[in-house]
């Protein structure tokens, strides 16, 4: 049994069936020695007196919050929550693997540039009784400062007949180093309760892996005197890290038609601009990635060639 | 919102079988611990079985272990008891519940219910 928060104790269960539990011995906060009982929730129902109270724990109908009394006033709070393991394995009920980029993914994280900013969210089915706690740092054995914010529902969506909810968190590296060649990775660690049951969720990854720039910014299109060619224009998205010079972009130009089966022309390019054949009813898009790390391709920008 | 329906109940001499079925409609039925517990006229519900959702491992009480068996079908929505040996403290009705927590013999461990069906076991 450890502590989560004051008064929110968190008892490790390895069940299979007929599983012994694990016994708790419960303390109520009272100088009092005399004349304490102890109840389970909302029940009248005495389970002890004195003021200790020993249990085994067995399944979630073990858990709760139990309270220790006397004289009807109430002394202390002491609220149990279970985290399962089973054959070896602990629960992860709360979360939905998102199996990008494999299995077992459940936190997914991104960072628009080198800054030390980054942002992980993660998906539910569970709508009510669920609370999130995010703690980071860079490395585990001397852990450097990272300062997450708290978990916010992001989004909603319908699948079949579940509604999904998307969860996100943004942190920032307190001492951050944009330049600097990382050797120890970031850990993210996410506390998740629902109703009675516990779980923990941890990422651990580099900067560098988990970038993904903005999508270029001011698309422009300059047509070529007597010629279907164009001249693309671009710029570096604002949340870039500067010096552009040092933190480079190449990108990836694409002319797409109408129909999606029509072959697509790309060029890549380390420049802001390009020359293509803007076709009839075709769009021209652009998308950023670092120049020197391959790490996620922006997201397109796009504009019509008409 | 889930709705649980249960069907099969019915009269048996004791030392017979019955088979209960409870058909989930809804928000998605795998996402969901499901239980069946039981109710004697005057007394308080008490808990039956439970079955989880992924891994399908299951929970019994006491008085029905070895006796009683949960199953679930999940392509069906359909969770199962499978009650052999009867014996005539098992009339009840009994119902089905779907909650979030395995294992769990607490029923309001468990958010939704069904409306039940009648178990007589004569002797």
């Known amino acids: 049994i450890w502590e989560l928060k004051k008064d929110v104790y968190v008892v490790e269960l390895d069940w299979y069936p007929d599983a012994p539990g694990e016994m708790v011995v419960l303390t109520c906060d009272t100088p009092e020695e005399d004349g304490i009982t102890w109840t389970l929730d909302q029940s009248s129902e005495v389970l002890g007196s004195g003021k200790t109270l020993t249990i085994q724990v067995k399944e979630f109908g073990d858990a709760g919050q139990y309270t220790c009394h006397k004289g009807g006033e109430v002394l202390s709070h002491s609220l149990l929550l279970l985290h399962k393991k089973e054959d070896g394995i602990w629960s992860t009920d709360i979360l939905k693997d998102q199996k990008e980029p494999k299995n077992k993914t459940f936190l997914r994280c991104e960072a628009k540039n080198y800054s030390g900013r980054f942002t992980c969210w993660w998906l539910t089915t569970i709508s009510t009784d669920l609370t999130f706690s995010v703690k980071s740092s860079r490395g585990s054995s001397d852990p450097q400062g990272v300062t997450c914010g708290a978990a916010t529902l992001s989004a909603e969506r319908v699948r079949g007949d579940n509604k999904e909810y998307e969860y996100s968190v943004e942190c920032q590296e307190d001492s951050a180093c944009p330049a600097a060649e990382e050797s120890l990775p970031i850990e993210v660690m996410v506390d998740a309760v629902h109703k009675l049951k516990y779980e923990n969720y941890t990422s651990s990854f580099f900067i560098r892996d988990i970038i993904k720039p903005d999508p270029p910014k001011n698309l422009q299109l300059k047509p070529l005197k007597n010629s279907r060619q164009v001249e693309v224009s671009w710029e570096y998205p604002d949340t870039w890290s500067t010096p552009h010079s040092y933190f480079s972009l190449t990108f990836c130009v694409q002319v797409q038609g109408k129909s999606k089966r029509e072959k697509k022309d790309r060029v890549f390019t380390d420049k802001t601009s390009a020359t293509v054949i803007c076709r009839k009813n075709a769009s021209i898009s652009v998308r950023a990635q670092d120049r020197y790390y391959s790490s996620s391709w922006s997201e397109w920008a796009s504009v019509p060639c008409s | 919102e889930v709705q649980l329906v249960e069907s099969g109940g019915g009269v048996v001499q004791a030392g017979e079988s019955l088979r209960l079925s409870c058909a989930a409609s809804g928000r998605s039925f795998s996402n969901y611990e499901m239980g069946w517990f039981r109710q004697a006229p005057g007394t308080e519900r008490e808990f039956v079985a439970a079955?989880?959702?992924?891994?399908?491992?299951?929970y019994y009480a006491d008085s029905v272990k070895g006796r009683f068996t949960i199953s679930r079908d999940n392509a069906k929505n359909t969770v199962y008891l499978q009650m052999s040996s009867l014996k005539p403290e098992d009339t009840a009705v009994y119902y089905c519940?779907?909650?979030?927590?395995?294992?769990?013999?607490?029923?309001?461990?468990?958010?939704?219910w069904g409306q039940g069906t009648q178990v007589t076991v004569s002797s």
């Open positions: 079955i989880s959702r992924r891994r399908s491992s299951t």
């Open positions: 519940a779907a909650g979030a927590l395995f294992p769990s013999s607490r029923s309001r461990d468990y958010d939704y």
